[in-house]
């Protein structure tokens, strides 16, 4: 008698390793013999697909060499025209030994930046990834973390992070090791001991001392008033990645002496500078303090730079402070038209925020000076070439007026946010986003270099020094 199909052995979940055989059985009782079709994730498996073998009148489906992509729900449907079609479904779970699909590579990184050693893996169950540094398992800490992807992220890379690394992927089916890779940490040139300024009598000898470090060890050059030192003797020594340079001078005129430490990182160079003045007694005059008031900036030149509605400090040592300070920035602004695209926005931010200083809340209007780190960033990172050229012109007396000098801060005389983060104003224009962290050049004192902070967009962008409190 005709009998509607009945599936006597329903499909079950099948576990299979990659490249192994996997079989689903769908035993059917019926008369007449049914037609059996198979689907994977509701898509019909074609009889002529060479990756599959369908036998026993369609009751056995064999995947001849399981691939990672064969994961899914497999269903058999039996129909013989008597009664309705019947269906049974089961899952194929592809198991796979760990495999490292993107192994780590050798990395050279500058101290303070973020390093990521890739280690992308495949496997089922999902492999756990750990890392070995040298011969020992790597312990995670506040700076090092194994990411979800398996990659190793090291924040604020330090010299001690240098070494040999490998990643290990492990699941219940086995373990895979990557090849050993090397993390090399390079360190920006940094001044450890800056030359000290001297006030001496005419015709005396002075020795300026400059010590720097970095990986690779930097070279030190001396600049006198913007030019290579023409007189004087230089003695150098290197020990434990520290270079020590002494410049002995016979003083017949005042001068600005700059120690420049440079080292190379690939195609790029890092530079740290420290300057000292040698003045001749009785040549300098003290500067007076003046007061001022706070008002909204109403000028034009600094409109794009200063925060909208920000209060700025106006210096009452001028008959018309707004006009005088605007003229000051206008004069200097024109000179910025010829500087590099990297330097120009940074220099404009520094100029505007230096001449039109942010006002502090309180009883009496007080200006907030720019943070030393931001000043140094402009001077030594964004505008190194231009700054040197300007100092050269100044010391050669090529500027007709001293007006422009009021718009250039002396970084060393500005407070550092390292000691008091509220003592000074940041320049948001110089801040980098978190995806592109950079560091400021090292400070010209023995303090550590400071990361460019990521400030909230709500923070003020109007800072500066009015000539009243000018640091020139």
């Amino acid at each position: 008698l005709p009998k509607a199909p009945v599936i006597t052995t329903p499909l079950e979940t099948v576990d299979a390793l990659v490249e192994e055989v996997a079989t689903f059985m769908c035993a059917v009782e019926s008369y007449p013999q049914p037609e059996i079709s198979w689907t994977r994730n509701k898509i019909l498996i074609k009889l002529f697909d060479t990756r599959y073998s369908i036998r026993e009148n369609g009751q056995l489906l064999t995947i001849l060499s399981v691939e990672d992509s064969d994961d899914g729900i497999y269903c058999c449907t039996a129909n013989n025209g008597v009664g309705g079609a019947v269906e049974s479904c089961g899952a194929l779970q592809v198991k796979m030994k760990p495999k490292i699909t993107r192994p780590p590579i050798n990395v050279k990184i500058i101290e303070g930046l973020k390093a990521v050693l890739p280690c992308t893996t495949m496997g089922n169950p999902k492999p756990s990834v750990s890392w070995i540094k040298g011969d020992s398992p790597l312990r995670e800490n506040s700076r090092t973390a194994v990411l979800e992807s398996g990659s190793l992220r090291i924040h604020n890379v330090q010299k001690e992070d240098a070494g040999q690394y490998r990643c290990v992927a492990k699941n219940s089916l086995g373990t895979a090791y990557s090849k050993v890779v090397k993390l090399e940490v390079e360190v920006f040139a940094r001044i450890l001991r800056a030359p000290e300024s001297h006030n001496v009598t005419f015709g005396s000898f002075v020795t300026l001392h400059c010590t720097a470090t970095g990986i690779p060890v930097p070279t030190i050059t001396w600049i006198e008033n913007g030019n290579a030192v023409s007189s004087g003797s230089i003695q150098e020594s290197v020990k434990d990645r520290v270079i020590d340079s002494r410049l002995q001078l016979f003083i017949t005129k005042p001068g600005l002496y700059t120690c420049i430490a440079t080292n190379k990182h690939g195609e790029k160079f890092s530079t740290a500078k420290a300057a000292a003045t040698v003045s001749i007694a009785e040549w300098s005059k003290p500067q007076k303090d003046n007061k001022g008031y706070c008002a909204q900036y109403r000028g034009e030149v600094c409109n794009a730079v200063l925060a909208k509605d920000a209060l700025v400090f106006l210096n009452t040592s001028y008959a018309d402070p707004e006009e005088a300070q605007e003229l000051l920035v206008h004069t200097a602004w024109n000179e910025l038209k010829v500087v590099s695209p990297l330097c120009r926005p940074a220099a404009e931010a520094l100029l505007c925020n230096h001449v039109f200083q942010e006002c502090s809340p309180g009883v009496v209007p007080t200006p907030i000076p720019i943070c030393r780190e931001y000043c140094l960033a402009v001077k030594e990172l964004f505008c190194a070439k231009e700054w040197l050229a300007m100092e050269e012109k100044t010391h050669r007396g090529l500027y007709r007026s001293e007006m422009h000098l009021l718009s250039v801060p002396e970084c060393s005389k500005l407070p550092s946010m390292h000691w008091d983060p509220t003592a000074c104003a940041r320049l948001p224009h110089l801040d980098y986003n978190k995806e592109n962290p950079k560091t400021f050049p090292p400070m010209t004192s023995s303090k550590p270099s400071v990361d460019i902070p990521n400030l909230p967009s709500s923070s003020s962008s109007s800072f500066s020094v009015s000539p009243t409190y000018s640091m020139t």
Partner: antibody, heavy 115, light 113 residues
Framework: EVQLVESGGGLVQPGGSLSLSCVAS????????MNWVRQAPGKGLEWLSV???????YYADSVKGRFTISRDNVKNTLYLQLNNLKPEDTALYYC?????????WGQGTQVTVSS | DIVMTQSPSSVTASAGERVTINCRSS????????????LNWYQQRLGQSPRLLIY???ARESGVPDRFSGSGSTTNFTLTISSFQPEDAAVYYC?????????FGSGTRLEIK
Amino acid sequence: EVQLVESGGGLVQPGGSLSLSCVASGFTFSLYYMNWVRQAPGKGLEWLSVIDTHSIAYYADSVKGRFTISRDNVKNTLYLQLNNLKPEDTALYYCVLGRTALVRWGQGTQVTVSS
Amino acid sequence: DIVMTQSPSSVTASAGERVTINCRSSQSVLYSSNQKNYLNWYQQRLGQSPRLLIYWASARESGVPDRFSGSGSTTNFTLTISSFQPEDAAVYYCQQSYKPPYGFGSGTRLEIK
């Protein structure tokens, strides 16, 4: 490393005077605002005075006219002159670096006003 | 003068617990020129000098663990310790620095359960 070392505290009679000093090191003293804060035994913190980089000073009402803050940028020293002292001025006096936050604190010097 | 009011006056917590301390100022401490709130938080452990934790209401001082965070604006502010640790047992003070005199709150004593 910033170091602030207070001195000059001691036992004084009501109506008497005292001069506190704070020697600063590890930073360019002249570029930063400096403060005095005190803490009476078992009590909270009380801000007393601030002096800016141009030696302009502000005071809490409780000490105005009796206490004077000053600084010597050459000696890297902050001072607090305490006059007409009262028993309620008994406290640990801290020297603190900071403009709009009190960032670095000294260990304090004890002032006791008692007859 | 701006008066600072802190609550609660004391609180006990177990390790790993979330702790919040509130601070209210009698006037706004938000400076419209730069949109910063001039409100600071300090920690004072027994027998030690106070230590700055948070400035400008939400900026964490360098070296302060990231379990400490500050929030709020204008007159209402909160210090949160996301996962209390035994070493966090101390007295916590808020302080306004919008204009002198720069008054402190009366303090919140945080003790371990």
